[in-house]
Amino acid sequence: KFSKQSWGLENEALIVRCPRQGKSSYIVDWYYSQTNKSIPTQERNRVFASGQLLKFLPAEVADSGIYTCIVRSPTFNRTGYANVTIYKKQPDCNVPDYLMYSTVSGSEKNSKIYCPTIDLYNWTAPLEWFKNCQALQGSRYKAHKSFLVIDNVMTDDAGDYTCKFIHNENGANYSVTATRSFTVKDEQGFSRFPVIRAPAHNETKEVEIGENTNLTCSACFGKGAQFLATVQWQLNGNKITDFSEPRIQQEEGQNQSFSNGLACVNTVLRIADVKEEDLLLRYDCLALNLHGLRRHTIRLSRKNPIDHQSTYC
């Protein structure tokens, strides 16, 4: 229930967040799950705990394993597990699937590639970017904050992109790399006011308490490559990132598809272990481009309102 996979490469920094979140003021203790041995908080240690974060500076293959974090609230202690795997550096340029973060899609006019997990680190711009292990050079490539923008994207821009940055911890520098695939949709066309395909406006979706559910926000923006075409979820009018509930996550990046020649973008809101409170929230699917903003609202309702007992404990 409160477990998360994390991975990294040996001799690089890896920072992992406790899957069991709480208020920032809460003390968090970390342990090696197998030995129950406490992980130190002193920064002179190679592996040390810093609040909700567990830091491997740098990581070693032998660090692989399950780590327990205990969030100490004023009432009860709440436990989470981080499943960490550290891999040996690959001798060749190939990045195996198990080291890849989620794939992102782009087009001629929408080509942002975000650097995964970077928000956990203390880094300074600019990022270094590589495609299929070659450093990106030329004015087409612009490293902006935590993402890469490619001008005039072409189909052969598809490939594996690696961001490399330096994490600084008390004056010491550690390298971090993260790789994800980028796919390109190349087509000429037109742009129009967004049309939301899903959900229908004021739709109600039946869910089971205790189960997981996904909500898809899908909109079409015209034909061919689009400039500034984005879809996102909001909860009660707030950004997902402003809503501090780890069970509710919007998938990173957006998937672009072409339906009957139309350029459509979708993003999925994943709700784990649905709770009664989630039924009280308003879920807004927002579609935005240069023509304007369209919003469709969906609410959740209980599938079996009578004598429903969750089988999830």
Epitope: Q21, G22, K23, F76, G210, E277
Partner: antibody, heavy 121, light 106 residues
């Protein structure tokens, strides 16, 4: 929707004990800590303590450690508070309550209707 | 235990008036919750995590503060806002409440 249904008013003699109940519905009972709060005109709102219905673990306000016992019955999704050795000082409205999202301790979002306890000879 | 001091204990305001009540804390806390209670009813969560409005709370309400000083403000007092407001800390056990500020309609 989330509901906390409390038992009815109690008139009890000094020195006696009373057990108040709080039946939870509309959510998974074992997913949330349940708290008890006492309200009097003199002392206002006072937190008595909390129980984790999943494990039965409890945390008490030291002031009420000898006064209250919190229990929970998973099978009926009901929490109980036994109030012992009652004096006139214990006359109060007692509420059961819980947070909106458990891990974030984001305030008592759901309250029972309250049970009036009157201690009188 | 953390002691919460609410001021004023009682206040009155006319419709349209700006109202501010404060909650002072004996030792620093990270967040503050506020509840509204009307006579004969259970308290309602009104503002949580210092500044977030609970569901259904009008936008004329706001909360602010840090450390040992927090406040609740109503920008344009309305008749329905007449009630008692309590602050509460969830920083350390035991959880504690303020004695309340009773807001009356002038």
């Amino acid at each position: 929707q989330v509901q906390l249904q409390q038992s009815g008013a109690e008139l009890v003699r000094p020195g006696a004990s009373v057990t108040l109940s709080c039946k939870a519905s509309g959510y998974t009972f074992t997913d949330y800590e349940l708290h008890w709060v006492k309200q009097t005109p003199v002392h206002g709102l006072e937190w008595i303590g909390t129980i984790d219905p999943e494990t039965g673990d409890t945390v008490y306000n030291q002031k009420f450690k000898a006064k209250a016992i919190l229990t929970a019955d998973k099978s009926s999704s009901t929490a109980y508070m036994e109030f012992r050795s009652l004096t006139s000082e214990d006359s109060a409205v007692c509420y059961c309550t819980r947070a909106f999202y458990n891990d974030y301790d984001d305030g008592f979002a759901y309250w029972g209707q309250g049970t009036l306890v009157t201690v009188s000879a | 235990q953390i002691v919460m001091t609410q001021t004023p204990a009682i206040m009155s305001a006319s419709p349209g008036e700006k109202v501010t009540m404060t909650c002072s804390v004996s030792s620093s806390v990270s967040y503050m919750h506020w509840y509204q209670q009307k006579s004969g009813t259970s308290p309602k969560r009104w503002i949580y995590d210092t500044s977030k409005l609970a569901s259904g709370v009008p936008a004329r309400f706001s909360g602010s503060g840090s450390g040992t000083s927090y406040s609740l403000t109503i920008n344009n007092m309305e008749a329905e806002d007449a009630a008692t407001y309590y602050c509460q800390q969830w920083n350390s056990s035991p959880l504690t409440f303020g004695a309340g500020t009773k807001l009356e309609l002038k």
